[in-house]
């Protein structure tokens, strides 16, 4: 049962690595660490170390999304950590690649029905208190491994089994073909190149780009929707401000994705949320009087 | 050892609204998924919904869509329900349950129940 | 919803005595299934998951078995202490849903 692989995993990541010869790359200082007779030491990275229980978070989140959508309960959660593990641990943290997480991918294999994908931009709040209300729309983060990793960080080490709970590479700092942002840029890729019909996005209104082409959404997620599957884009830029009443759909940046998208042969629709706090209250009661009016 | 500890009995006026707590302990809140379970007297029982503490996801079976709010507060492992427009036909027990994770998705662990009284 | 149909909805046997409670499903459940016993003024307690496994602390005497839309919970040698309604549940899809329950007594 779960307790046992815990039980099982605390064993080896804190008496596992010893065994095994270290060796380093990069420019990241050194740190000792352990308290055997040869001393040992660990790449110090500038981004954050691991999130705190990191493989109990991983396994108990598989077992929890499979006991609340019945339909992935085929999945084996034992084996879904460790294509997870085998993705990043005893590699460099710097050189991780897509085919890492092939694996892991794999096993996570869940389709979307046609026009019920919705992408999000530094917006994502907003985006997953919408498909709590609108069940049959689906972020990334909806999906199991989205879900398995949301909101989380991990790396290991080159040629030992310990996860790096000190710090991790850092995307700008470091290295951008580091665990995490490996993980999100193929779990992305396949998700949008999955999608069919009209896929949805959400845009931030208050950033001074609204679309960002260095974003995960405008580097990944524009360039792998299929022209063949997905017949339309349909932006929600959501105004932040009560009194903003102007047509951010005529931004340059919505401009510019307007033409990557089209030039892809997509259509591309944009609407204004004026109200986001209306918008959602309308999508869980769309019978109310006030929502016959725009939001 | 895991423990659901609910709050005690309520009685709640035609109209009004009551909310009941589970005290999770023994195990980390959020690695679990949190049910809630209606007993009406000598009646069977009838699944209201879940929540994932984690997340404050939530579902509900239709019937209790409009009756029944689910919330979770992380810092202080607790979840609630709070029951709104109590009606006679809310007068009942109400359950906090969860799985083991090794017990299927059967609900291995309850909380002792609280009596909602519905009268004027 | 998937209905689960309990039967019979009381019975009455003696010490010793073996009793079978059947439990069917409206649709095929796969071995998506629980029992629980519930003593007055008590919660419900899990006795077996995936429709034959014992819970634990659960006694041997407790057994299930069945899969799809057919199950039933026996119990040998009859005790005291199962003085008890039990339920069943499909844990296949949402909503979950119980059986109405079976009060055992003794004769």
């Known amino acids: 049962g779960l307790n046992d692989i815990f039980e099982a995993q605390k064993i080896e990541w804190h008496e596992g690595s010893h065994h095994h010869h270290h060796h380093h790359h990069g420019s990241g200082s050194l740190v000792p660490r352990g308290s055997g007779s040869l001393p040992r030491w660990r790449q110090q990275w500038s981004g954050s170390g691991t999130t705190s229980r990191f493989p109990e978070t991983v396994l108990a989140r598989c077992v929890k999304y499979t006991e609340v959508h019945p339909e992935m309960r085929h999945v084996d959660c034992q084996s879904v950590w460790d294509a997870f593990k085998g993705a990043f641990i005893s590699k460099y943290p710097c050189n991780i690649t897509e085919e890492d997480y092939q694996p892991l991918v794999k096993l996570g294999t869940q389709t979307v029905p046609c026009n019920k994908t919705l992408l999000w931009s530094r917006i994502k709040d907003l985006a997953h208190q919408f498909t709590q209300v609108q069940r049959d729309m689906f972020t990334l983060e909806d999906m199991l491994l989205g879900y398995l990793a949301d909101d989380l960080t991990w790396c290991g080490e080159f040629n030992t089994f310990e996860i790096n709970y000190q710090s991790c590479p850092d995307w700008r700092k470091d290295c951008s073909n580091n665990p995490v942002s490996v993980f999100w840029k193929t779990v992305s890729r396949r998700f949008a190149e999955t999608a069919c019909g009209v896929v949805h996005v959400m845009l931030n209104g208050s950033r001074s780009k609204i679309f960002d082409k260095n974003s995960t959404f405008g580097s990944v997620e524009v360039h792998n929707l299929q022209p063949e599957k997905v017949q339309a884009l349909e932006a929600w830029v959501i105004h932040g401000g009560r009194e903003d009443s102007r047509d951010l759909c005529q931004d340059p940046t919505i401009k510019e994705l307007e033409s990557i998208i089209s030039k892809r042969n997509i259509r591309f629709f944009c609407k204004n949320i004026y109200r986001p706090d209306k918008f959602l209250q309308c999508v869980k009661n769309p019978e109310d009087s006030s929502c016959l009016s725009g939001i | 050892e895991v423990q659901l500890q609910q709050s005690g009995p309520e009685v709640g006026r035609p109209g009004s609204s009551v909310k009941i707590s589970c005290k999770a302990s023994g195990y980390t809140f959020t690695d679990y998924i949190m049910h809630w379970v209606k007993q009406s007297p000598g009646q069977g029982l009838e699944w209201i919904g879940w929540?994932?503490?984690?997340?404050?996801?939530?579902d509900y079976a239709e019937k209790f869509k409009k009756k029944a709010t689910l919330t979770a507060d992380t810092s202080s492992s607790t979840a609630y329900i709070q029951l709104s427009s109590l009606a006679s036909e809310d007068t009942a027990t109400y359950f906090c349950?969860?799985?083991?994770?090794?017990?299927?998705?059967?609900?291995?662990?309850w909380g002792q129940g609280t009596l909602v009284t519905v009268s004027s | 919803d998937i209905q689960m149909t309990q039967s019979p909805a009381s019975l009455s046997a003696s010490l010793g005595e073996t009793v079978t409670i059947e439990c069917r499903a409206s649709e095929d459940i796969y071995s998506n299934l629980a029992w629980y016993q519930q003593k007055p003024g008590n919660s419900p307690q899990l006795l077996i998951y995936d429709a034959n496994s014992l819970a634990d602390g659960v006694p041997s005497r407790f057994s299930a078995s069945g899969s799809g839309t057919q199950f039933s919970l026996k119990i040998n040698s009859l005790r005291s202490e199962d003085v008890a309604s039990y339920f069943c549940q499909q844990y296949n899809n949402y909503p979950y849903t119980f059986g109405a329950g079976t009060k055992l007594e003794l004769k």
């Open positions: 929540i994932d503490p984690e997340y404050g996801r939530t």
């Open positions: 349950a969860r799985s083991a994770h090794t017990t299927g998705f059967g609900f291995a662990y």
